[in-house]
């Protein structure tokens, strides 16, 4: 037999909270348990579902869970079935609703001295108790002509008068909780003695020193009083005006006039109406002083023909909002066409060259007018005034290449030389009109030049070839003083270039002819064997047809080139001893000897007491020290040539003689002993 160990029992439950109907079964064989609600099987949902044999409620619902629940156990093999006792919920709930007018049928029918009944649509179980409120203040039964019927949850006002006007709300509470009305009811019962607004003052914006008018009217029986106040609560009357409102007038109809308005008059004005009964009505209006700021500057604009462009005019800050319009040549632009105004924008469609000029954006309000010009340039493609021409420029002189163009705006001109952009430096200058100046033309300037002139609208370019007209010049100029070695072969070269290949010849400066052993071979003067008589002044003459001739004077000296008779040798000296470095040279003219030690020339006038250079060229260093060690160079020179020879000087400590060495043992290196 199937036995219920735990049976479901009826119980209190709270709307929306958890609950559990218990059911436990004992049976000899397997049974399956299910639940019935009012005789119908219960389907599992997320809210309500079987938990073992029991039925669990995640959130009790007063509508879906009202009725009788029964636990059923069934043995599917034998068909035996057992049912538990019935169980139900006593569900406690409360639900908000609106305050509604029950009597009369519509608000339009509410008149002073009629009965008005309001109903509070808050429901619940157990039945809640109700509390009524007017303008947030609790109302108690039997007070001030009203009756509260808790059972009927009604509020009755009999008779209803102006004093009952206000916002009615209700709240209810029960064992379950509390709820307040979801929508409240405004009761408005006119009282002739209460002040009512007929005309409310409006905010005004006025220009400085203009006048401002505020209108204000109230009605009531008997007629209400009216008073004006300025921000600081100072009353304004025709008899007593505050110092900053001297020019204020209050008219019989309640209007307030302010003349010659100044910044200190700006602010909030309050118009207060008071009836015989009821609260004062306060109306506010603000007086603003009109203002307009300056407009930002426009950048000049460059547009290209055929394009469509827009220029936005940002209106200046102002009160009231300034109106904006565009003008060109003193005429206001239309709102459609090819050049027109759209909103705050100037629109130029399919721009033509004739559209260039000054356009003005105007902005105006009560405070005044502002304007700002924008300069519109319509860019044109440059056109030629003078193209660069193939030119012959003279070497060494300034050369000019023109690239004269005209356009709007002024064009940018750049020059290329052999496809390389030219920068301005000491040799090249580009003038703003496009002309290229080569300050001192050189042979290698003979090449292609190209100039490009451009504006935002387009560019043009042209090129020209420069041919350099070479100067008649020596290349290189001969040295004005040269030496030849006596009794040897010698050559003196002379070469020149010019527009035409020049002829070159040598002659003696005195006009005498060259001896037969001296030949002039295409500009090279050749001496087979130099004699003393070959010394003297010679002239190299280069000439060609178009450029005439040029001369270079050369003084030739015949010399016996320098040779050393005595050369300094590698020398080692004991510290404190004297070193002698010998050097003797011969030649014609007689050579002079100089010494260089430790990479500096030894000046005979500044040698000091330890060093001396003899007439024959030898160098003596007394009392040598380790720092005197190093390389010493003997330099022999005359007006024709120079020769040098060098040797090292070593300064060593004197060794202590050993017993084994005899008194005459030689040192292991060449030594000067003094």
């Amino acid at each position: 037999a199937i036995v219920f160990i735990k049976q479901p029992s009826s119980q209190d439950a709270l709307q929306g909270r958890r609950a559990l109907l218990r059911c436990e079964v004992e049976a000899p064989g397997p049974v399956h348990v299910y639940w019935l609600l009012d005789g119908a099987p219960v389907q599992d949902t997320e809210r309500r579902f079987a938990q073992g044999s029991s039925l669990s409620f995640a959130a009790v619902d007063r509508l879906q869970d009202s009725g009788t629940f029964q636990c059923v156990a069934r043995d599917d093999v034998t068909g035996e079935e057992a049912r538990s006792a019935n169980a139900s919920f006593n569900i406690k709930w409360i639900e908000a609703g609106p305050v509604v007018l029950k009597h009369p049928a519509s608000e339009a029918e509410i008149q002073p001295q009629t009965q008005v009944t309001l109903r509070c649509h808050i429901d619940g179980h157990p039945r809640p108790t109700y509390q009524w409120f007017r303008d947030g203040t609790p109302l108690s039964d039997g007070q001030s002509n009203h009756t509260v019927s808790s059972k009927e949850r009604n509020l009755t006002l009999r008779p209803a008068g102006p004093e009952h006007s206000g916002l009615y709300s209700c709240c209810a509470h029960s064992a379950f909780g509390q709820a307040c009305s979801s929508q409240n009811f405004t009761l408005s019962i006119a009282d002739e003695s209460f002040a009512r607004v007929v005309l409310a003052p409006q905010d005004v914006v006025v220009a400085r020193y203009e006048e401002a008018m505020f209108h204000c009217q109230f009605s009531a029986q008997p007629p209400p009083s009216l008073q004006w106040l300025f921000e600081d609560e100072t009353p304004i009357t025709n008899r007593s005006r505050p110092p900053h409102l001297r020019r204020a007038t209050v008219f019989a109809n309640g209007s307030l006039l302010l003349t010659q308005v100044r910044p200190r008059n700006a602010g909030i004005y309050r118009c207060i109406g008071q009836g015989q009964r009821g609260p004062p009505i306060i109306l506010e209006a603000t007086l603003h002083l009109a203002e307009i700021e300056d407009m930002p500057l426009f950048e000049p604009r460059v547009f290209t023909a055929g394009s469509e462009e827009r220029v936005t005019c940002l209106p200046p800050k102002g009160l009231p909002e300034p109106s904006v319009w565009w003008e060109h040549a003193g005429v206001r632009l239309p709102t459609h066409g090819r050049v027109y105004q759209k909103g705050h924008e100037l629109v130029l469609a399919n721009i033509a060259e004739s559209d260039a000029g000054v356009y003005t954006c105007h902005a105006a309000n009560l405070a005044g007018q502002r304007r700002q010009d924008v300069n519109i340039t319509v860019a044109t493609v440059p056109s030629w005034l003078k193209k660069p021409q193939d030119s012959q420029l003279e070497e060494g002189k300034p050369g000019y290449l023109d690239c004269l163009t005209q356009a709007t705006p002024k064009p940018t001109v750049v020059w290329y030389r052999n496809q390389m952009l030219i920068s301005e430096d000491s040799r090249f200058e580009v003038f703003k009109n496009g002309t290229l100046r080569i300050n001192s033309v050189e042979v290698y300037d003979g090449t292609w030049y190209r100039c490009m002139s451009s504006t935002p609208a387009g560019s043009i370019e042209a090129q020209a070839r420069v041919q350099v007209l070479e100067k008649l010049k020596f290349t290189p100029p001969p040295q004005p003083q040269q030496c030849m070695e006596f009794d040897k072969e010698a050559t003196v070269p002379c070469s020149a270039t010019g527009r035409e290949k020049p002829t070159i010849k040598w002659e003696r400066a005195d006009g005498s002819s060259l001896p037969e052993w001296v030949t002039d071979n295409a500009g090279t003067l050749h001496f087979a064997r130099v004699t003393r008589d070959d010394a003297g002044n010679y002239t190299c003459i280069a000439s060609n047809g178009p450029q005439g001739q040029i001369r270079a004077h050369v003084q030739l000296t015949v010399a016996v080139f320098i040779t050393f008779k005595v050369e300094p040798e590698r020398t080692t000296v004991y510290q404190g001893h004297t070193a002698l470095l010998q050097c003797e040279a011969q030649g014609d003219p007689k050579p002079l000897i100089q010494w260089k030690g430790k990479d500096r020339i030894l000046d005979p006038t500044k040698l000091g007491p330890r060093m001396h250079i003899f007439q024959n060229g030898s160098l003596v260093i007394h009392d040598v020290a380790p720092e005197d060690s190093g390389r010493y160079t003997c330099i022999a020179g005359n007006s024709c040539n120079i020769k040098h020879t060098e040797a090292p000087l070593y300064v060593v400590d004197k060794p202590v003689p050993e017993e084994s060495e005899g008194p005459g043992s030689p040192p292991p290196y060449k030594m000067i002993q003094t």
Epitope: E424, F431, K432, N433, S453
Partner: antibody, heavy 118, light 111 residues
Amino acid sequence: QVQLQQSGAELVKPGASVKLSCTASDFNIKDFYIHWVKLRTEQGLEWIGRIDPEDGETKYAPKFQGKATITADTSSNTAYLQLSSLTSEDTAVYYCARASSGPWFAYWGQGTLVTVSA
Amino acid sequence: DIVLTQSPASLAVSLGQRATISCRASESVDNYGISFMNWFQQKPGQPPKLLIYAASNQGSGVPARFSGSGSGTDFRLNIHPMEEDDTAMYFCQQSKEIPWTFGGGTKLEIK
């Protein structure tokens, strides 16, 4: 050789104006554009504007419109920069520079220090 | 206006190494095959000196270790090898359209 010689340092009071000069030697200013550039240590270099001394046409950076006026006197081969309503923000070194129709500055003046101080 | 953004604001490079300064324009500075971007060097108490004009062309008397590259909106100044004398402020400048504008500058120092 090409040189732009600028006038000496200026110490001026706030609200005052100052006029700087830039005299060219070894070239005619009519053949070139003369530009003015402002240097402040923190802000770096700022282009003020330029003049075509031949016809007096000027172009300015928007920031310096109303603040700077560039003029030129071709007879003395000199360009000028006038700065008005001076404030501490105008304390800077001002350079003039030469440009041809190829738009780059190859030659500059040595600069003029303007100090605005009460 | 064309805005030039230079980076980095400061840079320290060892002697003999490469220094690279970048300059980005808010719009292209190219026109008719030329990039109108120039680079200047400025040392204290001296006016700026034109190093590179038209993006990649060396100014007069500028050592070969200074080179410029780039087109459109992105440009670079390279210095290699870095020398003691290169310590200075470096500015990029566009001359495509008025108003001509400069970058904020890069301070180059020896590491």
